[in-house]
């Protein structure tokens, strides 16, 4: 069978959801609860921000960043960056996956206002067995966690 | 076969579209059109603005509503809020699933500005047979109708 | 099987990519990488632009365009309108799949304000075998191409 | 804790009116679609109404329409079944019940209408 | 109007024993719509089963719901003293709720 993933065991799939120590201020990709309320495991494996493909194959991954503020942060770039990133033994660096790029902050007109924004991702990629995806955004100052219902990231096998 | 349904069973999917009846102006969830157009039920039943889940799985359930306006009207918050939700007789309350804030008329600068956004939502939820999900938006007001593809609400088993 | 493509064969999916020839200028639809980098077919066509279905059934499809700019165009509309379109031999026009409507230059308050925004469409619809979806966007002058990682088009069946 | 309390019922003659009221509370009302179920002495459960939660689609049984009329004040958590023209058939212990789907989840106490010459 | 008939209309059986409940509509009934009930006498009706085979909270799992289109079980595998009540199925369809007539539960 081509796909005898399909008639003989479970289709991977996860939903990791933001949670309060998604946020590390250290650079590195966000982290994310992987038991708790929503978010599951299924036939994937997860490992520091990352989830980690057990079975190769095309998976559509997704991820959603709640965005918001009071006007712009001192020394902000008009930019945020989200995105889905893989790592692979095969390559040294990460490699994009899907990537947005917004402007929220311009949405604030006076430096009071208070503004929301969100960013969602979703596409099919190549996923070998061992390979991680991650979630970063940049500048992650602006994004609002509260109960894993605004920010998520998660895949499943297609 | 831990994933029966994959071999025997058509896969669980719906896609239905906003009409002109989906904003009852009531504070209840968005109703949809079920059968006309693009829209679809098979494996899945609706009600009253419902998706009711008839074989219990994961689900990538998804939205998308059309946001426009001129300006802000007079008293809106400055916040709009697109989610989906659960209810489930398991739980007393609805449960929040997945949920996006957005601040679309703070990008119009003056009051005669028209202005358009859109809200996207999708992920991975695990669903009992005979529960429902729905979708609310708050303040519904500002949703714009057309014709199916720019307000919509959809799930797959995955 | 009513579902004998899950058990015996590949299931039909998709992802392309933005590339510089994307963007035409003529008032068609975009164009996409197939092959290289992230991009692939698997039991789905192309063909000038359009994905086409090689095996009917219900398809999620999805695409994210990258907006950006400095201010606003000169005489361009306060409307970005990025859709996906399907085209049959059963009707002469295209016909709108799922749509969406922006006013990302708004967000800028000034002329040399430089912006970024992002569109991201996906649904459940039903394709026969033989059909092509396409991607528009008007005004496609918007669209910010890079690597193949902020603007795609993809879909699978579900 | 979620609690549905029935109120109003009572003696009435063939062909009077009487209202039966239902006060919820422990959920969010204003949610969820509400029900009224009633059961005949030493009978079965005969559904009787339904509304959504914002009052936009409402149901009757067959033996009820053009008699009995279901509202609900969501700013009061409140449900009410106003019942006109009744007959003998009509006695019964009248219950409110939330629905999900098909399922009626919580169920009041229920209020015994008895319709008697 | 869609018609469940409940059988058997009495049931008598002994703590320990397992007990099997049919509930037959005279037409297709969506699975996500049917639903089963306890009710004791003096008492309102209490949820059982949601959507064919979904045991709602508290629900001991001796207590399992199956069945599609128009044949439904509810089955108790083991009685329990406690069990011993009328047992209704109900669904939705067309607009309106119907309830079979129940089924006694009675002990022997």
């Known amino acids: 069978l081509i796909q005898e993933r399909r008639s003989h065991e479970v289709n991977p799939a996860a939903h990791l959801t933001g949670a309060n120590s998604s946020l590390t201020g250290s650079g590195g990709p966000l982290l994310w609860e992987t038991q708790l309320g929503l978010a599951f495991l299924r036939g994937l494996s997860y490992h520091d921000g990352a989830l980690v493909v057990t079975k190769a194959g095309y998976y559509y991954i997704y991820s959603k960043v709640q965005l918001g503020g009071v006007g712009c942060p001192l020394g902000l770039a008009s930019t945020i960056t989200h995105g889905l990133y893989k790592r692979t033994p095969r390559y040294p660096e990460e490699l994009e996956l899907l990537v947005s790029q917004q402007s929220p902050c311009g949405r604030a007109t006076s430096s009071s206002r208070v503004w929301w924004d969100s960013s969602f991702l979703g596409g099919v990629v190549h996923l070998e067995a061992g390979e991680e995806v991650v979630v970063r955004v940049l500048d992650e100052r602006l994004v609002r966690l509260r109960d894993g219902t605004r920010s998520y990231f998660g895949a499943f096998m297609v | 076969l831990i994933q029966e349904r994959r071999s025997h069973e058509v896969n669980p999917a719906a896609h239905l579209t906003g009409a002109n009846s989906s904003l009852t102006g009531s504070g209840g969830p968005l109703l949809w059109e079920t059968q006309l157009g693009l829209a679809f039920l098979r494996g899945l039943s609706y009600h009253d603005g419902a998706l009711v889940v008839t074989k219990a799985g994961y689900y990538y359930i998804y939205s998308k509503v059309q946001l426009g306006g001129v300006g802000c009207p007079l008293g809106l918050a400055s916040t709009i809020t697109h989610g989906l939700y659960k209810r489930t007789p398991r739980y007393p309350e609805e449960l929040e699933l997945l949920v996006s804030q957005q601040s679309p008329c703070g990008r119009a600068t003056s009051s005669s500005r028209v202005w358009w956004d859109s809200s996207f939502l999708g992920g991975v939820v695990h669903l009992e047979a005979g529960e429902e999900v729905v979708v609310r938006v708050l303040d519904e007001r500002l949703v714009r109708l057309r014709d199916g593809t720019r307000s919509y609400f959809g799930a797959f088993m995955v | 099987l009513i579902q004998e493509r899950r058990s015996h064969e590949v299931n039909p999916a998709a992802h392309l990519t933005g590339a510089n020839s994307s963007l035409t200028g003529s008032g068609g639809p975009l164009l996409w990488e197939t092959q290289l980098g992230l991009a692939f077919l698997r039991g789905l066509s192309y063909h000038d632009g359009a994905l086409v279905v090689t095996k009917a059934g219900y398809y999620y499809i999805y695409s994210k365009v990258q907006l950006g700019g400095v201010g606003c165009p000169l005489g361009l509309a306060s409307t970005i309108t990025h859709g996906l379109y399907k085209r049959t031999p059963r009707y002469p026009e295209e016909l709108e799949l799922l749509v969406s409507q922006q006013s990302p230059c708004g967000r800028a308050t000034s002329s040399s304000r430089v912006w970024w925004d992002s569109s991201f469409l996906g649904g459940v619809v039903h394709l026969e075998a033989g059909e092509e979806v396409v991607v528009r966007v008007l005004d496609e002058r918007l669209v910010r191409l890079r690597d193949g990682t902020r603007s795609y088009f993809g879909a699978f069946m579900v | 804790e979620v609690q549905l309390v029935e109120s109003g019922g009572g003696l009435v003659q063939p062909g009077g009116s009487l209202r039966l009221s239902c006060a919820a509370s422990g959920f969010t009302f204003s949610r969820f679609n509400m029900n009224w179920v009633r059961q005949a002495p030493g009978k079965g459960l005969e559904w009787v109404s339904y509304i959504s939660s914002s009052s936009y689609t409402i149901y009757y049984a067959d033996s009820v329409k053009g008699r009995f009329t279901i509202s609900r004040d969501n700013a009061k958590n409140s449900l009410d079944l106003q019942m006109n023209s009744l007959r003998d058939e009509d006695t019964a212990v009248y219950y409110c019940a939330r629905s999900i789907a098909a399922a009626f989840d919580y169920w009041g106490q229920g209020a015994l209408v008895t319709v008697s010459s | 109007e869609i018609v469940l008939t409940q059988s058997p209309g009495t049931l008598s059986l002994s703590p320990g024993e397992r007990a099997t409940l049919s509930c037959r509509a005279s037409?297709?009934?969506?699975?996500?719509?049917l639903t089963w009930y306890q009710q004791k006498p003096g008492q309102a009706p209490r949820l059982l089963i949601y959507g064919a085979s979904s045991r709602a909270t508290g629900i001991p799992d001796r207590f399992s719901g199956s069945g599609s289109g128009t044949d439904f079980t509810l089955t108790i595998s083991r009685l329990e003293p406690e069990d011993f009540a009328v047992y209704y199925c109900q669904q939705y369809g067309s607009s309106m709720y119907t309830f079979g007539q129940g089924t006694k539960l009675e002990i022997k």
């Open positions: 037409q297709s009934v969506s699975s996500s719509y």
